[in-house]
C-alpha cells in the first residue's frame, strides 16, 4: 500500500478566521462547462474565501455555481464557525527548499530562482519552462519568503516588509488574504485542466488543487496550459508538495507527517469540507 503523510493537527479556537465551508461542493473549482453561452454566475473561491463572479457556459459544470452572490454566500459561508485546524509553527523550511535546481525537460529557457541549500541563499537558475520541481520561484522575493531564514531563524513571512533585491530598498509587500492553506509550488498547479484546441485525445494528468490529487484528463494535443503531465508520477512530483499551511501572522508552517493514506483524506476534508 503506497503510503502518504498524515497531518498532526491541533483543533483550536484561534486567531485565523476559519475556512467556513458548509458543503463540500464549495471547494470545487469554478467550472464553466463545455457549452458556449455567456452567463454570469457566482462560485466560492477557497483561496480568497469569497464568493466571486465567473462566466458559465450554460451546461454541465459543478455544484459550486450560484445565480446570485447572496445564494453563494448563504450556501458556502457561515459566521458562527468557531474552530479551525492548524499546525504548530516549525522552524523548518518546506521540503522542496532542499531540492536541487531542476531545469525540467522543456527548452523555453527563462530565469527563475531556487534555494541553494549549500550557500543558504536564493539564487537564479536557468529553467526550461515546464516540469522541474517545487524549488522554483518566479521572483527572488518569493524564494526568500519561503526558503530563506529570517533574522530570528524562522521563515520570513509574506506580511512584513521585505528587502527589494533589485535596489536594496525596503518595500512593504502587498498583504495577502490569509488562508489556511497557501500553494507555493509552480502556479500552474492551481490552474484547471485545459484540453486545448486540437482534436486528439491523449491521456494526460493534471493536478487538482481542490482535492490535492493528480487526476487523468484528455488532452487535445495542442494548446492548454502547463498543468499537463504525461504520467501521474510526474504530476505528483511537480505539484503534490505545494500546499503549505499558514498561521495568522503569515509564518510558514511545515506539517509534521506520518505515513497513512486514509488519514490524509480525513484531515484534508476536515479543513475543506466538514460542517463547522
Amino acid at each position: 500500500d503506497s503510503e502518504e503523510d498524515e497531518e498532526h493537527t491541533i483543533i483550536t479556537d484561534t486567531e485565523l478566521p476559519p475556512l467556513k465551508l458548509m458543503h463540500s461542493f464549495c471547494a470545487f473549482k469554478a467550472d464553466d462547462g463545455p457549452c458556449k453561452a455567456i452567463m454570469k454566475r457566482f462560485f466560492f473561491n477557497i483561496f480568497t474565501r469569497q464568493c466571486e463572479e465567473f462566466i458559465y457556459g450554460g451546461c454541465e459544470g459543478n455544484q459550486n455555481r450560484f445565480e446570485s452572490l447572496e445564494e453563494c454566500k448563504k450556501m458556502c459561508t457561515r459566521d458562527n464557525a468557531n474552530r479551525i485546524i492548524k499546525t504548530t509553527l516549525q522552524q523548518e523550511k518546506p521540503d522542496f527548499c532542499f531540492l536541487e535546481e531542476d531545469p525540467g525537460i522543456c527548452r523555453g529557457y527563462i530565469t527563475r530562482y531556487f534555494y541553494n541549500n549549500q550557500t543558504k541563499q536564493c539564487e537564479r537558475f536557468k529553467y526550461g519552462g515546464c516540469l522541474g520541481n517545487m524549488n522554483n520561484f518566479e521572483t527572488l522575493e518569493e524564494c526568500k519568503n519561503i526558503c530563506e531564514d529570517g533574522p530570528n531563524g524562522f521563515q520570513v513571512d509574506n506580511y512584513g516588509t521585505q528587502l527589494n533585491a533589485v535596489n536594496n530598498s525596503l518595500t512593504p509587500q502587498s498583504t495577502k488574504v490569509p488562508s489556511l492553506f497557501e500553494f507555493h509550488g509552480p502556479s500552474w498547479c492551481l490552474t484547471p485542466a485545459d484540453r486545448g484546441l486540437c482534436r486528439a485525445n491523449e491521456n494526460r494528468f493534471y493536478y487538482n488543487s481542490v482535492i490535492g490529487k493528480c487526476r487523468p484528463f484528455k488532452y487535445s494535443g495542442c494548446g492548454g496550459n502547463e498543468n499537463n503531465f504525461t504520467s501521474k508520477q510526474e504530476c505528483l512530483r511537480a505539484c503534490k508538495k505545494g500546499f503549505i499551511q499558514r498561521i495568522s501572522k503569515g509564518g510558514l508552517i511545515k506539517t509534521k507527517r506520518k505515513r497513512k493514506k486514509q488519514r490524509v483524506k480525513i484531515a484534508y476534508e476536515e479543513i475543506f469540507v466538514k460542517n463547522m
Partner: antibody, heavy 119, light 108 residues
C-alpha cells in the same frame, strides 16, 4: 579590489581553436557567475555563456553551444573560454564579466582579449 | 531569443540637451530584468542602470530609466561632455541573455 585580468591578443587561422583566460582576484571566485561576452568590430555585445565555478554550472547561448567550452579552475580563480572551429566572423574582443548569483548585473569586466581570425 | 532593438542607432546632440534612448523588446521583459550599460571607445562596458531605473554606483542623477513590457527608455536630462558614449540595453529574463545593438550618443 575586484579585478578580472584577461590573457593577451590572439591571431588564429580559420578552423583553429583559441583558449582565453580570465584571472579573478579580490572576491570569492566560486560565489559569482562568470560570463563571456564578445563584441565584433563596430558591433554590439553578444552573450556567449556563463559558468558558476562552485559546482561548474554552465549555461550557454545555443548559438555557441557546439563550439564554446567554458571551464573554471578554482585553485587559481581562473575562468577559461575555448572557442573551436574558428571563422572570420569570430574576430572580436572577448570579455569576461562577473555577476552575482541573484541577477545578471555584470559589475566588473575584464579588459578584453582581441581575437583575430584570418588566413 | 528576445531581440532588443535600440533606436536611434546614432543620436547627435549638444551638451545641455535632453537625450532619449529607446529599447524595444521582441517579447515582454519584466522590468526587473532590463539593464543598461555604457561603453566608451577602447573600454569595456560599464553597468549603468539595473532593474529599468536603478542607477549604478557613480552614475549621475541626470540619468533616469523607465518602461515596462516591451518598451524601455534611458533619458539624460541635460547632457554633459562625459555622457557621449554608446549605450546598450540588456535583458536577462530569457535565455540566451541578449543586448541591443547599441545607441551611439555623439556630440553634434
Amino acid at each position: 579590489e575586484v579585478q578580472l585580468v584577461q590573457s593577451g591578443a590572439e591571431l588564429k587561422k580559420p578552423g583553429a581553436s583559441v583558449k582565453l583566460s580570465c584571472k579573478a582576484s579580490g572576491y570569492t571566485f566560486t560565489s559569482y557567475w562568470m560570463h563571456w561576452v564578445r563584441q565584433a568590430p563596430g558591433q554590439g555585445l553578444e552573450w556567449i555563456g556563463e559558468i558558476k565555478p562552485d559546482k561548474g554550472r554552465i549555461n550557454y547561448n545555443e548559438k555557441f553551444k557546439t563550439r564554446a567550452t567554458l571551464t573554471a579552475d578554482k585553485s587559481t580563480s581562473t575562468a577559461y573560454m575555448e572557442l573551436s572551429s574558428l571563422r572570420s566572423e569570430d574576430t572580436a574582443v572577448y570579455y569576461c564579466a562577473r555577476s552575482s548569483v541573484i541577477d545578471v548585473a555584470m559589475d566588473y569586466w575584464g579588459q578584453g582579449t582581441t581575437v583575430t581570425v584570418s588566413s | 531569443e528576445i531581440v532588443l532593438t535600440q533606436s536611434p542607432a546614432t543620436l547627435s546632440l549638444s551638451p545641455g540637451e535632453r537625450a532619449t534612448l529607446s529599447c524595444s523588446a521582441s517579447s515582454s521583459v519584466s522590468s526587473s530584468y532590463l539593464y543598461w550599460y555604457q561603453q566608451k571607445p577602447g573600454q569595456a562596458p560599464r553597468l549603468w542602470i539595473s532593474g529599468t531605473s536603478i542607477l549604478a554606483s557613480g552614475v549621475p542623477a541626470r540619468f533616469s530609466g523607465s518602461g515596462s513590457g516591451t518598451k524601455y527608455t534611458l533619458t539624460i536630462s541635460s547632457l554633459e561632455p562625459e555622457d557621449f558614449a554608446v549605450y546598450f540595453c540588456h535583458q536577462w529574463s530569457h535565455y540566451p541573455f541578449t543586448f541591443g545593438q547599441g545607441t551611439k550618443l555623439e556630440i553634434k
